[in-house]
Interface confidence: low
Amino acid sequence: QKLSKHKTPAQPQLKAANCCEEVKELKAQVANLSSLLSELNKKQERDWVSVVMQVMELESNSKRMESRLTDAESKYSEMNNQIDIMQLQAAQTVTQTSADAIYDCSSLYQKNYRISGVYKLPPDDFLGSPELEVFCDMETSGGGWTIIQRRKSGLVSFYRDWKQYKQGFGSIRGDFWLGNEHIHRLSRQPTRLRVEMEDWEGNLRYAEYSHFVLGNELNSYRLFLGNYTGNVGNDALQYHNNTAFSTKDKDNDNCLDKCAQLRKGGYWYNCCTDSNLNGVYYRLGEHNKHLDGITWYGWHGSTYSLKRVEMKIRPEDFKP
């Protein structure tokens, strides 16, 4: 969530005579603002899923879309602006560095970091997010992408439990899942998702979604997607839209079966899959024999396990 989009004015010089009083006052204001901000964040968390669902629903109703979409977005925007103003006020009294705040790879890009690779995102006390190591794609389609998943080597098992998918696992330079909690935080602003795939013949395809939101843990990291564009032949994530995340130890799917156990991964299983990007990595020769592989139905079908996949996100309003 980008909470502060404004340049923070320099901290005013405090006169020595009234320094202590003003510091006390400022501390009180900051405490006040922080608690208000915390409340707003909680409120925004509660409202966000329903707002997003409204927005999604509107996108499919072309006639009624515009007016209701505007309502939903203005409600979201209003909440954001309130937080923006409050964080700005608080930040002016606390720190000078918030003008340089880095929330994701798009923030880094805007600050002229243009080389793809590993970066450390600083902790954000207001959002309660810790320091996070991310891999930034600064080249594809304008750059500014934060990679949330990669499959390329097969050296990391993705048949993990809820806690591991929540926190993230793997190697940031190799195969990894960034972590549902991190992805949720990163998608609290309007966000795009891009999925890139490569088959064993070296063909490359992509799918992009105009909105991407991961609900919070209370909502089982439910997936919300907007409009699809791409060249992969079909939208194999749509079947998983508005579906909760499931792992081998947490069955949230829409099936009598335990899809995570059948498909050997953690994913937004419906009943069960049109895609299974967190499935088993099968090497050449084994890649076209299994239904629990890294699959995208409609390109090569449900028994063809892909060679490489990357899932990446960036803000919808990103401009290279």
């Epitope: 079947y239 059948l262 009943c271 239904l291 139905y297 079908g301």
Partner: antibody, heavy 120, light 107 residues
Framework: QITLKESGPTLVKPTQTLTLTCTFS??????????VGWIRQPPGKALEWLAL???????RYSPSLKSRLTITKDTSKNLVVLTMTNMDPVDTATYYC????????????WGRGTPVTVSS | DIQMTQSPSSLSASVGDRVTITCRAS??????LAWYQQKPGKAPKLLIY???SLQSGVPSRFSGSGSGTDFTLTISSLQPEDFATYYC?????????FGGGTKLEIK
């Protein structure tokens, strides 16, 4: 030679549960990629897909009927069973089972169909 | 759900005629389309899958074409046994959906 044959009651009363069995030979539901689906056709109307089950027990249902349908398989006996609860006269139709081979969701071989009438 | 619209709903033709039936999807379905033939009192029979692939054992006078939203089934030279009802079916995503059918009758 591959064959599929549907069996079940020809007459069902409203609110009752319909149980249909598809018995097949010439292929196995333990073979990777193989599925069996159910499709129905009301008199003089178009085909309507109901449900699918795959060798690995993956199941798909028509969303409009999902709450009423259950599809199961017995691989060792070469049969697939479809149950449909709370039958209504509008469910009067010929019910077909068919094989889906591969992963492209089309049906290359069909049973002859079994007519089901829902009436009190 | 993806809606499949077939046209015409009925068609009269003579033996030897070239006949074209069209099927339109409510959204792009790439090449995930199948065509079936059904005769009265019989089960449907698969003719074409993946929009243009001829099913084994089906005469070569049947052909399919199209991609995205618009598809056609063509019978190059009608034979007496071809008079039947034809259905298209999208195999792009579940729920699988069929067209309303085209009844091909003898003129």
């Amino acid at each position: 030679q591959i064959t599929l044959k549907e069996s079940g009651p020809t007459l069902v009363k409203p609110t009752q549960t319909l149980t249909l069995t598809c018995t097949f030979s010439g292929f196995s539901l333990s073979t990777s990629g193989v599925g069996v689906g159910w499709i129905r056709q009301p008199p003089g109307k178009a085909l309507e897909w109901l449900a699918l089950i795959y060798w690995n027990d993956d199941k798909r249902y028509s969303p409009s009927l999902k709450s009423r349908l259950t599809i199961t398989k017995d691989t060792s006996k070469n049969l697939v069973v479809l149950t449909m609860t709370n039958m209504d006269p509008v469910d009067t139709a010929t019910y077909y089972c068919a094989r889906d081979y591969g992963d492209y969701w089309f049906f290359d071989l069909w049973g002859r169909g079994t007519p089901v009438t829902v009436s009190s | 759900d993806i809606q499949m619209t077939q046209s015409p709903s009925s068609l009269s033709a003579s033996v030897g005629d070239r006949v074209t039936i069209t099927c339109r999807a409510s959204q792009g379905i790439s090449s995930y389309l199948a065509w079936y033939q059904q005769k009265p009192g019989k089960a449907p029979k698969l003719l074409i899958y993946a929009a243009s692939s001829l099913q084994s054992g089906v005469p070569s006078r049947f052909s399919g074409s199209g991609s995205g939203t618009d598809f056609t089934l063509t019978i190059s030279s009608l034979q007496p046994e071809d008079f039947a009802t034809y259905y298209c079916q999208q195999s792009f995503s579940t729920p699988l959906t069929f067209g309303g059918g085209t009844k091909l009758e003898i003129k």
